[in-house]
Interface confidence: medium
């Protein structure tokens, strides 16, 4: 019921061995079951965490410590709302070679969602 | 205010079963993972596994599948931790530990503020 | 199963730099996390995201992470430091946690 998705930020472009942690919105759903997509495949083994906003509205992270080329592509997040999939817009994730000055397209984050994660 | 309350300390026989509980308060309990960790007496501390209350979903380390199982009430607000057949190398502290924020099932990242007071188990013949 | 290595012990003086390593394969893709444990008492997060500290803990605990290596350093070690210590991170296919042995910190 009403239920909104966003992936941000649209396009992200870091140095190769930085940290990303990229996120995403869900609103109209109680308890999400977030999944991350790259390239069109579920990720796996990678840590992911949710933060409820409210009772209705959780920010799903995806993080990752140190980013290699193999990391580079298109992420989207994917929820399953009443038997539908529910999926964001893409966000695009480009390298430039380590210590290469990288512009960063960041979504606002608010201080409270700045928490710990495992992946570099 | 966030309290993690553990039962009592209890003493077992080798091929006893037991329950120990960990009942929470002070947050939703739902929102949060509750995890196990053991300390042998004098020794490190080992992460068993952990529960996401709201959907059951459970992890367990390596070490620990299959030996306990990890549950959890929603209507207490109460995580469990048991065993069907104890050995004399459970004997232990054992911690129920609150991890900081809401996660997600698969592969969770834990950031832990709030540990109870542990749980002395011991087992002997 | 993926083991997180730290030395047994380590002793300084007073007003010295102690510093405790762990090591284990899969620390250049996670986060290593430490906690500080004293006697009788519950563990204490200390750092976190290899080298955030947390809110409360002194300015003379710090980390750091290189390669396979996470480091706790405590500059000017103090008595009340005395402690356990023990890294914390994840498996490499983060589907399980890890302790390390931990470190018994002497400040003699």
């Known amino acids: 019921a009403g239920l909104k998705l966003m992936g941000a930020p649209v396009k992200l472009t870091v140095s190769q061995g930085q940290p990303v942690k990229l996120n995403c919105s869900v609103e109209g759903m109680e308890e999400p079951d977030i999944q991350w997509v790259k390239d069109g495949a579920v990720v796996q083994n990678l840590d992911q965490l949710y933060i409820p906003v409210s009772e209705q509205h959780w920010i799903g992270f995806l993080s990752l410590k140190s980013v290699e080329r193999s990391d580079a592509g298109r992420y989207w997040c994917q929820v399953e709302d009443g038997g539908e999939t529910e999926i964001s817009q893409p966000v695009w994730l480009t390298l430039v070679p380590r210590g290469s000055s990288a512009h960063h397209h960041h979504h606002h984050h608010h201080s409270a969602w700045s928490h710990p994660q495992f992946e570099k | 205010e966030v309290q993690l309350v553990q039962s009592g300390a209890d003493v077992k026989k080798p091929g006893a079963s037991l329950t120990i509980s960990c009942q929470a308060s002070?947050?939703?309990?739902?929102?949060?993972?509750i995890s196990w960790v053991r300390q042998k007496p004098g020794k490190g501390l080992e992460w068993m596994g952990r529960i996401r209350p709201l959907l059951s979903h459970t992890m367990y380390g390596p070490s620990f599948q299959g030996h306990v199982t990890i549950s959890a009430d929603r209507s207490t607000a109460t995580a469990y931790l048991q065993w069907r057949s104890l050995e004399a190398s459970d004997t232990a502290m054992y911690y129920c530990?609150?991890?900081?924020?809401?996660?997600?099932?698969?592969?969770?990242?834990?950031?832990?503020?709030?540990w109870g007071p542990g749980t002395l188990v011991t087992v002997s013949s | 199963s993926y083991e997180l290595t730290q030395p047994p012990s380590v002793s300084v003086s007073p007003g010295q730099t102690a510093r405790i390593t762990c090591s284990g394969d899969a620390l250049p893709k996670k986060y290593a996390y430490w906690y500080q444990q004293k006697s009788g008492q519950a563990p204490v997060l200390v750092i976190y995201e290899d080298a955030k500290r947390v809110s409360g803990i002194p300015e003379r605990f710090s980390g750091s992470s290189s390669g396979t290596m996470a480091t706790l350093t405590i500059s000017g070690a103090q008595v009340e430091d005395e402690a356990d210590y023990y890294c914390?991170?994840?498996?490499?296919?983060?589907?399980?946690?890890?302790f390390g042995g931990g470190t018994k910190l002497t400040v003699l």
């Open positions: 530990v609150r991890s900081w924020l809401a996660t997600s099932g698969g592969t969770i990242p834990e950031y832990y503020q709030h």
């Open positions: 002070g947050y939703t309990f739902t929102d949060y993972w």
């Open positions: 914390y991170s994840a498996s490499a296919n983060g589907n399980y946690r890890v």
